[in-house]
Interface confidence: low
């Protein structure tokens, strides 16, 4: 199905408008903000989700930048330009003609410039580190149980193949999930690690993007895993280009 046939909704993206106007009266769903048709059997791209989110703006957030080559989404929300396949365009500009280059997850990777700024290619984010701090529990979670549960979550909920979950590290109360996906590894139909990470981030924050599903109730051997802090670091196949002023 393109979408749920009975009531014509998009199970993987509630920020859509759906109607039975597809071929043969099939349910077809379009993302808010962009009007682009989306495939409801898989995750919607982060670019289209951000664009939809900006059609009903909320407060931007700010995250901490950790190190030289790892990027964090410090700039918060913006209304992105997406290509016809729903990916971020390499160059993004705001209404005041300030432009910058982004990576495949839409995070700025250069200083801001003007309309003359060139972004030759969309640089792929091939390594994502999701840093979680869980709320105190009676004791530490069993590492292997936690590892299995998080791998299952990414496979089942986000349809990310287990081979892209490189590692799950745990030192109470910090959990780190490493997602790795090179350009050469990503086959047609594979969920992008950037999209999976974004869905996960929204789930963790209680802002699930899934239609009509309950929020994420993550448990390890029955014990709730309640996250109190999330940081996501992005590493690109080509290091970002910032001026020395920004790095000091």
């Amino acid at each position: 199905h393109t979408a749920a046939q009975d009531n014509c909704t998009c199970p993987t993206n509630k920020m859509t408008v759906c109607s039975p106007d597809g071929p043969g009266g099939r349910c077809q769903c379009r993302a808010l903000g962009s009007g682009m048709a989306v495939d409801c059997s898989t995750l919607t791209s982060k670019c289209l989700l951000l664009k939809a989110r900006m059609s009903a703006p909320k407060n931007a957030r700010t995250l901490v930048r950790p190190s030289e080559h790892a990027l964090v989404d410090n700039d918060g929300l913006y209304d992105p330009d997406c290509d016809p396949e729903g990916r971020f365009k390499a160059r993004q500009c705001n209404q005041t003609s300030v432009c910058w280059c982004v990576n495949s997850v839409g995070v700025r990777r250069t200083d801001k410039g003007d309309l003359s700024l060139r972004c030759d290619e969309l640089v792929r984010t091939h390594h994502i580190l999701i840093d979680l701090r869980h709320r105190p529990t009676a004791g530490a979670f069993n590492h292997s149980d936690l590892d299995a549960e998080l791998r299952r979550l990414f496979r089942e909920r986000y349809r990310l193949h287990p081979k892209f979950v490189a590692a799950v590290h745990y030192e109470q109360p910090t959990i780190q999930i490493e997602l790795r996906q090179n350009t050469s590894q990503k086959a047609a139909g594979d969920v992008d690690i950037g999209d999976a990470a974004y869905y996960f981030e929204r789930d963790i924050k209680g802002e699930s993007l899934f239609q009509g599903r309950g929020g994420l109730d993550l448990r390890v051997r029955g014990e709730p895993l309640q996250v109190e802090r999330t940081l996501i670091y992005y590493l690109d196949e080509i290091p970002p280009k910032f001026s020395m002023k920004r790095l000091t």
Epitope: C40, T42, E149, E156, H161, D190, L216, R219
Partner: antibody, heavy 119, light 111 residues
Framework: QVQLQESGPGLVKPSETLSLTCTVS????????VHWIRQPPGKGLEWIGV???????DYNSALMGRVTISVDTSKNQFSLKLSSVTAADTAVYYC?????????????WGQGTLVTVSS | DIVMTQSPDSLAVSLGERATINCRAS??????????MHWYQQKPGQPPKLLIY???NLESGVPDRFSGSGSGTDFTLTISSLQAEDVAVYYC?????????FGQGTKLEIK
């Protein structure tokens, strides 16, 4: 409507390789994984393995080393190969589509094809 | 591997009466708010047909006399009012992890 159809030789000699094809019609095969399941005569169902949309495969460890699942997207076909067969591999073999996003199981099944292992 | 055990192996119920089939998993198949348990119906000479997914969700086109319940390790398939066309073998199956495994099947007949 998605349809799956298994095909292949109905008789295979012991120690040889069983080869089956699953042809999908009425939908894109690139959007879904495909599972293979078998059922010995008069018995229950056994999951053999799956090929995901990425082309990556997962197999039942009980058959590990003997089973290979592959895809030919140009022909809309999936294939199953099971080597070194014995009489215990006699079964109806089914291919089934990995279900839509929120089901996490197999929704559309082929009619199945009986494979007998005998000399 | 998770072992699925169904009970009873066979069941005879009068037309219009309630039929109940149980399935027990050797470890929990519920997590993250979902129960990865599914029920299939198989009639002679036919492939299995998905009836219930994720423990309690009715597959499209399946009559609403079928229902599923349970969580953790214990699950139940209920047919509220048995019809002649419900005679079949019923299987439970989990997708909590790989490999997926099935119960041994329950044969449902008319008394």
């Amino acid at each position: 409507q998605v349809q799956l159809q298994e095909s292949g030789p109905g008789l295979v000699k012991p120690s040889e390789t069983l080869s089956l094809t699953c042809t999908v019609s009425g939908g894109s095969i690139s959007s879904y994984g495909v599972h293979w399941i078998r059922q010995p005569p008069g018995k229950g169902l056994e999951w053999i393995g799956v090929i995901w949309t990425s082309g990556v495969t997962d197999y039942n460890s009980a058959l590990m080393g003997r089973v290979t699942i592959s895809v030919d997207t140009s022909k809309n076909q999936f294939s199953l190969k099971l080597s070194s067969v014995t009489a215990a591999d006699t079964a109806v073999y089914y291919c089934a589509r990995d279900a839509d996003y929120d089901r996490y199981t197999m929704d559309y099944w082929g009619q199945g094809t009986l494979v007998t292992v005998s000399s | 591997d998770i072992v699925m055990t169904q009970s009873p192996d066979s069941l005879a119920v009068s037309l219009g009466e309630r039929a109940t089939i149980n399935c027990r998993a050797s470890k929990s198949v519920s997590t993250s708010g979902y129960s990865y348990m599914h029920w299939y119906q198989q009639k002679p000479g036919q492939p299995p047909k998905l009836l219930i997914y994720l423990a309690s969700n009715l597959e499209s086109g399946v009559p609403d006399r079928f229902s599923g319940s349970g969580s953790g390790t214990d699950f139940t398939l209920t047919i509220s009012s048995l019809q002649a066309e419900d005679v079949a073998v019923y299987y439970c199956q989990h997708s909590r992890e790989l490999p997926y495994t099935f119960g041994q099947g329950t044969k449902l007949e008319i008394k």
